[in-house]
């Protein structure tokens, strides 16, 4: 199929970085500056992405590949190929329409992005709260109350080291 295609369509011989120029007897012409073609046989080149404003260039455009953008400090990428930049917040906050707001009591966010999430409800798993939650950290669940009955230890002590040549008592 490939051989047939190249015999029938001279454009299939045009490599990445060029376009098949219909105005000039289908010769392969180089992509203009600020454009690229990442595959062979294209009839036009594509406009390079411009990383402007809050976007900054992570990888320059070449004749065969598009530019890649990321976000300036204080922002993070969202969407496929970093199509959007969203403002960072502090840990313990979430981004709202009015800017960064502290997490409500009972919720936390341990990242600079995303929303505040509810603390884990330890009791749903029959466990107790070992360490209280904060705006920045989830609660730490401990053993269930049944495990904490008198005589029961929440932490298993390490086995005592045996001296060489002694059998256990």
């Amino acid at each position: 199929f490939e051989r047939t295609r190249s015999l029938q369509d001279p454009c299939s011989n045009c490599p990445a970085g060029t376009f098949c120029d219909n105005n000039r007897n289908q010769i392969c012409s180089p992509c203009p500056p600020n454009s690229f073609s990442s595959a062979g046989g294209q009839r036009t080149c594509d406009i390079c992405r411009q990383c402007k404003g809050v976007f900054r260039t992570r990888k320059e455009c070449s004749s065969t590949s598009n530019a890649e953008c990321d976000c300036t400090p204080g922002f993070h990428c969202l969407g496929a190929g970093c199509s959007m930049c969203e403002q960072d917040c502090k840990q313990g906050q979430e981004l709202t329409k009015k800017g960064c707001k502290d997490c409500c009591f009972g919720t936390f966010n341990d990242q600079k992005r995303g929303i505040c999430r509810p603390w884990t409800n330890c009791s749903l798993d029959g466990k107790s709260v070992l360490v209280n939650g904060t705006k920045e950290r989830d609660v730490v669940c401990g053993p269930s109350p049944a495990d904490l009955s008198p005589g029961a230890s929440s932490v298993t002590p390490p086995a005592p080291a045996r001296e060489p040549g002694h059998s256990p008592q």
Partner: nanobody
Framework: EVQLLESGGGLVQPGGSLRLSCAAS????????VGWVRQAPGKGLEWVSA????????YYAESVKGRFTISRDNAKNTLYLQMSSLRAEDTAVYYC???????????????RGQGTQVTVSS
């Protein structure tokens, strides 16, 4: 109709200078992306330089950076390429080109002139 007429080529010794001109009609050079491409004997086309965006940002191929300067005279609707420190490898036919942006988002370019021959030889 878009027309581009190149002039200013010739025979020059290595290290010499030339100034190419491209008189445009049918469009305004100050409002379009325009530049110069060249074709050396037995080789394909190569972009040399361009003025991109109406803001006037310039592009130069690595092989000509620091030696060639692109400019335009809006009143005369003419594009120029000042070439200095010319080398044998600059020998080529030089064409004035207009970048064409298609409605579907594609980019190509127009070569409407006959080109002007530049030969660098001692």
């Amino acid at each position: 109709e878009v027309q581009l007429l190149e002039s200013g080529g010739g025979l020059v010794q290595p290290g010499g200078s030339l100034r190419l001109s491209c008189a445009a009609s049918g469009f305004t050079v100050s409002a379009e992306d325009v530049g110069w491409v060249r074709q050396a004997p037995g080789k394909g086309l190569e972009w040399v330089s361009a003025i991109l965006d109406s803001g006037g940002s310039t592009y130069y191929a690595e092989s000509v950076k620091g030696r060639f300067t692109i400019s335009r005279d809006n009143a005369k609707n003419t594009l120029y390429l000042q070439m200095s420190s010319l080398r044998a490898e600059d020998t080529a036919v030089y064409y004035c080109a207009r970048v064409v942006y298609h409605s579907g988002g594609g980019v190509t370019f127009d070569l409407r002139g006959q080109g002007t021959q530049v030969t660098v030889s001692s």
